[in-house]
Interface confidence: medium
Amino acid sequence: EEELQVIQPDKSVSVAAGESAILHCTVTSLIPVGPIQWFRGAGPARELIYNQKEGHFPRVTTVSESTKRENMDFSISISNITPADAGTYYCVKFRKGSPDTEFKSGAGTELSVRGKPSAPVVSGPAARATPQHTVSFTCESHGFSPRDITLKWFKNGNELSDFQTNVDPVGESVSYSIHSTAKVVLTREDVHSQVICEVAHVTLQGDPLRGTANLSETIRVPPTLEVTQQPVRAENQVNVTCQVRKFYPQRLQLTWLENGNVSRTETASTVTENKDGTYNWMSWLLVNVSAHRDDVKLTCQVEHDGQPAVSKSHDLKVSAHPKEQGSNTAAENTGSNERNIY
């Protein structure tokens, strides 16, 4: 009679994580009598996967019920596959004895596990940066297999080209990770912009995963200042305004100085938002010119988002206005908030 052969028809099997893997094995003869065992790997360190004679293998079931005489199908199904299950599986025929002795092995079936990449996580720089500066964004995704993966960067739908990507580890592994760094040049219009990292993998069936970062968390747009003198409201009063334009984020503190002395400090509250996401704010100072004998240097000083202060000054020509007798005060007014400075 022809000698028994152990046939594993599939050289390789690929299964998505979480699914079941069926590993096929048949034998060609009933002789010699003895059990079949399944192993992962070969050699002395091989791992026993299934042996009904002894042991407990809750994830393994037999494909054939093998409750017929002369059964020759020893295929198994392994449930809830994870990347850790990847490897080469051998169906091995033993000859019955005390103990059973290995008689013949199948050629092996390589099980590869298709693991989905995790949702990409995009992170930006720790500190804010201003327009015209280049900032780096990183994108990370883990746990995918096989190794082949595609990563793209977009800014507002436009694909970026300045990035570097690494997939680790370089050698064989049960699962892989990807790390990519993209460089993005900021513009003043980027408050509403988004940077997107897009990952495509065979397990995603053409529906890539995306991670996003809002540039509003990265950008700082410094304000432009303009100090103007409004027409005289009353005979001895001049309204001076400081227009703070196009700044982001909103955190801003404004100080008025008269000839270098602090007159008033306030925090931006009722700002107006521009279409591009930046803010405008206006502060005004009502100056009683009759309180001054000499010209007054008015300075609008702005500290934005913890950065060094920027300022803009305006010279108020006192000589151009008649002085009011008996008055020695300059009154400032912003809205309903009035204070007298002596």
Epitope: V27, S29, L30, I31, V33, G34, P35, I36, Q37, Y50, N51, Q52, K53, E54, T62, E65, S66, T67, K68, R69, E70, N71, M72, F74, K96, G97, S98
Partner: antibody
């Protein structure tokens, strides 16, 4: 838990037909095979036949000509019919749940659960 | 088709060790697996050994099975004999499509 229970007449006339029922609970007849085993008084047990999980049957060749095994999976019952009974068919009749050890070319059958048995006497 | 032969009876003292043989009449004892069953009077049999030497988890480790090719026999060994071990014991194997039982052995604990 797994339970098997045989039922049928305790007394059968010679040359008549024996009908036994095995009612099971705790497992599915679609997943396990069942055998009938009898033990004549003062002798060792004798395997009579098997109802496979998929509905096929196998019989002891010495009894095949007068034995029939069937089932009703909806009622969880397996039936034995044996005709032309003689006095030497007297004994205890058991239904047993079969286990086979996967990975042997002749799956090693052993009987992991037995019913309590029913005594059948063939006498006029 | 082979037969399996067991002694009609075996006896042993309490806490002693006994062995019940089961001899195969033709063919090699190693050509098929052997199981053993215990039957107390008035109770259904229970499987105590399967696949020559495997013990179901619920069975005491005082029970063990083996095969001996020189005598073409399987054996059931019970150590530290207890009164409750007094019962009938029978072996079982198979030939092609037929399951074959031994005639049974009555174990008496003295």
């Amino acid at each position: 838990q797994v339970q098997l229970k045989e039922s049928g007449p305790g007394l059968v006339q010679p040359s008549e037909t024996l009908s036994l029922t095995c009612t099971v609970s705790g497992f599915s007849l679609a997943s396990y095979s069942l055998s009938w085993v009898r033990q004549p008084s003062g002798k060792g047990p004798e395997w009579m036949g098997r109802m496979y999980y998929d509905g096929d049957t196998a019989y002891n060749s010495a009894l095949k000509s007068r034995l029939s095994i069937s089932r009703d999976t909806s009622k969880n019952q397996v039936f034995l019919k044996m005709n032309s009974l003689q006095t030497d068919d007297t004994g205890t009749y058991y239904c047993t749940r079969d286990r086979s050890m996967f990975g042997t070319d002749y799956p090693h059958w052993y009987f992991d659960f037995w019913g309590p048995g029913t005594m059948v006497t063939v006498s006029s | 088709q082979f037969t399996l032969t067991q002694p009609k009876s075996v006896s042993g003292a309490l806490r002693s060790t006994i062995t019940i043989p089961c001899e195969r009449s033709s063919g090699d004892i190693g050509d098929s697996y052997v199981s053993w069953y215990q039957r107390h009077l008035g109770r259904p049999p229970i499987n105590v050994i399967y696949a020559d030497d495997q013990r179901p988890s619920e069975v005491s480790d005082r029970f063990s099975g083996s095969i001996d090719s020189s005598s073409n026999s399987a054996s059931l060994t019970i150590t530290n004999l207890q009164m409750d071990d007094e019962a009938d014991y029978f072996c079982q194997s198979y030939d092609s499509k037929i399951d074959i039982f031994g005639g049974g052995t009555k174990l008496t604990v003295l």
